[in-house]
């Protein structure tokens, strides 16, 4: 009898009430593997969650977060509110970055500005709450007669994590 159940494919369940016949999963349920005795209830993306992928008979629904929130946890188990750039989310809510730190994301915490002098460079553009400092050539390179440095065109800024 166990062998009969193992023949039931994904999207079905082994129905004990019907001599272990493979029955399709009822609406709003799924089985992602074969040989299941029950189908699992589909996840519902409600409230701060929105549907990224609809439930099918063989796979669960996938949720994302509505605008103004971002996912946390495996399979987006939680939505956490965004802050503005130049802020960090503390346990008491969004708070401006302290002087000397920045956040160019809508999530995470404020990061210390780069210390250009550690790599023997000088500050070309001061940092703000939203942007890191831009380091230029070393002070020695800026002596009279040295060619002025043009910062490279920025590539995609770090921090754009795909969900």
């Amino acid at each position: 009898l166990q062998d009969l159940c193992s023949n039931c494919p994904a999207g079905t369940f082994c129905d004990n009430n019907r001599s272990q016949i493979c029955s399709p999963c009822p609406p709003n349920s799924f089985s992602s593997a074969g040989g299941q005795r029950t189908c699992d209830i589909c996840r519902q993306c409600k409230g701060v969650f929105k549907t990224r992928k609809e439930c099918s008979s063989t796979s669960n629904a996938e949720c994302d977060c509505i605008s103004g929130y971002h996912c946390l946890g495996a399979e987006c188990s939680m939505c956490e509110q965004d802050c503005k750039q130049g802020q960090e989310l503390t346990k008491k809510g969004c708070k401006d970055c302290c002087f000397g730190t920045f956040n160019d994301q809508k999530r995470g915490i404020c990061r210390p500005w780069t210390n250009c002098s550690l790599d023997g460079k000088s500050v070309l553009v001061n940092g703000t709450k939203e942007r890191d400092v831009v380091c230029g050539p070393s002070p020695a390179d800026l002596s009279p007669g040295a060619s002025s440095a043009t910062p490279p065109a920025p590539a995609r800024e770090p921090g754009h994590s795909p969900q």
């Epitope: 946390l72 994301q105 915490i109 990061r111 780069t114 400092v133 770090p158």
Partner: antibody, heavy 120, light 110 residues
Framework: QVQLVQSGAEVKKPGASVKVSCKAS????????MHWVRQAPGQGLEWMGW????????NYAQKFQGRVTMTRDTSISTAYMELSRLRSDDTAVYYC?????????????WGQGTLVTVSS | SYVLTQPPSVSVAPGETARITCGGD??????VHWYQKKPDQAPVLVVY???YRPSGIPERISGSNSGNTATLTLSRVEAGDEADYYC????????????FGGGTQLIILG
Amino acid sequence: QVQLVQSGAEVKKPGASVKVSCKASGYTFTGYYMHWVRQAPGQGLEWMGWINPNSGGTNYAQKFQGRVTMTRDTSISTAYMELSRLRSDDTAVYYCAREPGYYGSGLDYWGQGTLVTVSS
Amino acid sequence: SYVLTQPPSVSVAPGETARITCGGDDIGDKRVHWYQKKPDQAPVLVVYEDRYRPSGIPERISGSNSGNTATLTLSRVEAGDEADYYCQVWDSSSDYPGVFGGGTQLIILG
């Protein structure tokens, strides 16, 4: 899939320098900060610093300032960590690790580690 | 700089629940991350931002954080859970932004 592949083991004499590489694949290299963490034999994990692969901006733990230099070559999606004036207590496994896209979360992908042995 | 304190070891029988603590001043105001480290392997992130599991980490691993203590809980422990576990925070206000605890060796008895 995301992968960080580090250079092979090194044996160095005290006073020398070592440069460890970390080649990234499976994601946009310039889009994620890279960190370096080490573990000496029988000791815990120790954070060394980070580099922004986009701008080249760095931040080093105070303990390593003046001895460590983190660089990158975006054309080959590789980050480097150079440690100079090596001492015997720099013997450790050195790891590169990727930040997940914003500061304040855990380091989600790690290289396999590079053993650096400092011995006379 | 900020200090994180972990017990050197925690022992537990298979099938039981292991709790590993990480102490720090007002650590409840910070986001705590936990890594599993096995010999000759790279660390693996098992919990981030106090209580969230990355994909692929089993549900029996969980985290909490309040006051001066963060806790990593492993329920129904298995032999494969034997490893060192490290807590970690980011402390932007110090000269040492990345801070790790000293690590806790989880010993599975029997």
